[in-house]
């Protein structure tokens, strides 16, 4: 298997996932497409952690571009006899992948906390509150309680959808970076490609 090609595949995937993370996080600032709640600071505290913009987004672009840069047309050297620089690059990509793991891990943790706590909303008493914070995430299973939030409109659906998307995207990014750690270690130790005859796209 060509480790460089696999790294490039992972890199391209991470770029797409990072952009989706950034988009999902930005949407969290505009419940129901409205700007007033951000300006009034009536958003969940976990929205302000920038988990999708920084953790699953910008921080993910660094390893993504490192991985993309690894694969070249002349990628095949064998078992350490040639392309020592590329083997070093593969090993250094492990460091980039670890940065990616940290970013995606941060995204996953914050998204999970945001889901568990629920949104900040105007509750049935007319108070801006974390209405579902005490339910330990059980509100996710009982949609009949979601009407306890009177404002913003559909805020529970909005928060649950977008934090779930961030959780899923961050999880995929985490797995891809983990794969690249393994890929990078194998590529660095075994050689950039194992033979001229066998090349596989991942």
């Amino acid at each position: 298997m060509c480790y460089g090609k696999c790294a490039r595949c992972i890199g391209h995937s991470l770029v797409g996932l990072a952009l989706l993370c950034i988009a999902a996080n930005i949407l969290l600032y505009f419940p129901n497409g409205e700007t007033k709640y951000a300006s009034e600071n009536h958003l969940s505290r976990f929205v302000w952690f920038f988990s999708g913009i920084v953790g699953g987004g910008l921080l993910m672009l660094l390893p993504a571009f490192v991985f993309i840069g690894l694969e070249q047309d002349d990628c095949c050297g064998c078992c350490g006899h040639e392309n020592c620089g590329k083997r070093c690059a593969m090993l250094s990509s492990v460091l980039a992948a670890l940065i990616g793991i940290a970013g995606s891990g941060y995204c996953v943790i914050v998204a999970a906390l945001g889901l568990a706590e629920g949104p900040l909303c105007l509750d049935s008493l007319g108070q801006w509150n974390y209405t579902f914070a005490s339910t330990e995430g059980q509100y996710l299973l009982d949609t009949s309680t979601w009407s306890e939030c009177t404002e913003p409109k559909h805020i529970v659906e909005w928060n649950v959808s977008l934090f779930s998307i961030l959780l899923a995207l961050g999880g995929i990014e985490f797995i891809l970076c983990l794969i690249q750690v393994i890929n990078g270690v194998l590529g660095g130790i075994c050689g950039f490609c194992c033979s001229h005859q066998q090349q596989y796209d991942c």
Partner: antibody, heavy 120, light 106 residues
Framework: EVQLVQSGAEVKKPGASVKVSCKAS????????VKWVRQAPGQGLEWMGW????????IYAADFKGRVTMTTDTSTSTAYMELRSLRSDDTAVYYC?????????????WGQGTLVTVSS | EIVLTQSPATLSLSPGERATLSCRAN?????INWYQQKPGQAPRLLIY???NLASGIPARFSGSGSGRDFTLTISSLEPEDFAVYYC?????????FGGGTKVEIK
């Protein structure tokens, strides 16, 4: 001047429905909720529920759930309260009240009240 | 449901006297509001958040208390103060009112 003006008195038969209107003026309608409170003759005050005028989401008191519907028309700054399946003990003065959101939540502006009499 | 019990049910006093109205909850609450109602009129907000004077309300009205016991005090009764007074809690749904205290002229 901030005020809430309610529709006139109504006389209804048991089993019928009544719809009371409440027109707001002198303030931004969607910045405050509207609560509905009723008072039976010679009795105390009873909270029926409230509506978020910005989103249109209502919250009903358990005793009235399934029998009451609260709506708003933001174009005319008017709130409505419809009570169905009327009984004789629904005879009361119905008030709409401006509701201030926040840590201190209070009813600072009251309508003049609408007397609903349920009698066969 | 939080039940508010007001006492006394009726308070007979003369103008110029001090009136002390009590409101007791069956469980602890954060704040209460006080309203005044005169015959044939809608209630009027007097005190919000236990101790804050509503706009346009004279300084002779004051509120205090915490937990389960709350008090409305009228330092010196004026003729226009003879009315029914209600306390109201907003700590949990349903929002509830006390049964009222009627302040009448002695």
């Amino acid at each position: 001047e901030v005020q809430l003006v309610q529709s006139g008195a109504e006389v209804k038969k048991p089993g019928a429905s009544v719809k009371v209107s409440c027109k707001a003026s002198g303030y931004t309608f969607t910045n405050y909720g509207v609560k509905w409170v009723r008072q039976a003759p010679g009795q105390g005050l009873e909270w029926m529920g409230w509506i978020n005028t910005y989103t249109g989401n209502p919250i009903y008191a358990a005793d009235f759930k399934g029998r009451v519907t609260m709506t708003t028309d933001t174009s005319t700054s008017t709130a409505y309260m419809e009570l169905r399946s009327l009984r004789s003990d629904d005879t009361a003065v119905y008030y709409c009240v401006r509701f201030q959101y926040g840590d201190y939540r209070y009813f600072d502006v009251w309508g003049q009240g609408t007397l609903v009499t349920v009698s066969s | 449901e939080i039940v508010l019990t007001q006492s006394p049910a009726t308070l007979s006093l003369s103008p110029g006297e001090r009136a002390t109205l009590s409101c007791r909850a069956n469980s602890g609450i954060s704040f209460i509001n006080w309203y005044q109602q005169k015959p044939g009129q809608a209630p009027r907000l007097l005190i919000y958040g236990t101790a804050n004077l509503a706009s346009g309300i004279p300084a002779r009205f004051s509120g205090s208390g915490s937990g389960r016991d709350f008090t409305l005090t009228i330092s010196s009764l004026e003729p226009e103060d003879f009315a029914v007074y209600y306390c109201q809690q907003y700590s949990s749904n349903p929002l509830t009112f006390g049964g009222g205290t009627k302040v009448e002229i002695k």
